[in-house]
Amino acid sequence: AILGRSETQECLFFNANWEKDRTNQTGVEPCYGDKDKRRHCFATWKNISGSIEIVKQGCWLDDINCYDRTDCVEKKDSPEVYFCCCEGNMCNEKFSYFPEMEVTQPTSNPVTPKPP
């Protein structure tokens, strides 16, 4: 293990399209991988008229955009599909939306997932 790096060994798993995708609907996903590859957790969700709908959660392949992120935070401004990734066991259990705006002060929109 690299000092200061959070190893991801398992992530919260959820798939809204589990029947079509032939997966489980919910659970814990173990994240295996090559020694030289990092694994991350992720969450994707939609905001439909103020209601949070989780699309998928699980393990995410080695991705520099996820390195050293202990919290799962989406920073893009009003995406159609929200996405965040992080490092550390079950770090995708909670995810949040903090849009990076140039002028206005960013507002916190923490999200506690409640799978249906």
């Epitope: 079509k20 996903e29 992720f42 699980g58 995410w60 991705d63 159609e80 599909v81 929200y82």
Partner: antibody, heavy 120, light 107 residues
């Protein structure tokens, strides 16, 4: 090394069936989904569906529903794709492709392709 | 189904040129996008996954960017072995779909 080896070229008559095999080696066969993609001459890539080798469950593109059957034999680490009621438009190269275990599920290893020609 | 639209359908370029290919999804797919390279008579080869992550063994002159609906594949300095057809593909929802392809030809 990780490898997918497909069966040889086939020539079939319209209305017949074809069964293409894809033998996996160099990794744990049951840990990775296998997808099938085809490519008609001079055309782009078309996704057909996938099989989950561990349990055998499948999901097919609507276009092929009722005509395609994907199966697997875990004892030989082989997946099969059978396409029935063949027509001339099914003339294509058929590829099997292993999909990474985790999101966003890229197709990281491909077979060499099997040419299927449908002609009367 | 999610439609993937690639442009241009073909591009003529010289060795050393910078080449940019775009791919647009008909609806948001977050970062569930991969890019493949295919040479005549060969199987496709994975170049980029997760919109911007380089697959092991792929030269660093290839790069990907984008998120949501708009994506780009860039070859920073075209090499002789890069003349091929490139496809984008979404894996966000079934059925998985490919772009129509972009053929990179020698000028």
């Amino acid at each position: 090394q990780v490898q997918l080896v497909q069966s040889g070229a086939e020539v079939k008559k319209p209305g017949a069936s074809v069964k293409v095999s894809c033998k996996a080696s160099g990794y744990t066969f049951t840990s990775y989904r296998m997808h099938w993609v085809r490519q008609a001459p001079g055309q782009g890539l078309e996704w057909m569906g996938f099989i989950v080798p561990s349990g055998g469950s499948t999901s097919y593109a609507q276009k092929f529903q009722g005509r395609v059957t994907m199966t697997r034999d875990t004892s030989t680490s082989t997946v099969y794709m059978e396409l029935s009621s063949l027509r001339s438009e099914d003339t294509a190269v058929y590829y099997c492709a292993r999909v990474s275990r985790y999101a966003p599920e890229p197709m990281d290893v491909w077979g060499q392709g099997t040419t299927v020609t449908v002609s009367s | 189904d999610i439609q993937m639209t690639q442009s241009p359908s073909s591009v003529s370029a010289s060795v050393g040129d910078r080449v940019t290919i775009t791919c647009r999804a008909s609806q948001g797919i977050s970062r569930w996008l991969a890019w493949y390279q295919q040479k005549p008579g060969k199987a496709p080869k994975l170049l980029i996954y997760a919109a911007s992550s380089l697959q092991s063994g792929v030269p660093s002159r290839f790069s990907g960017s984008g998120s949501g609906t708009d994506f780009t594949l860039t070859i920073s300095s075209l090499q002789p072995e890069d003349f091929a057809t490139y496809y984008c593909q979404q894996a966000f929802s079934h059925p998985w779909t490919f772009g129509g392809g972009t053929k990179v030809e020698i000028k």
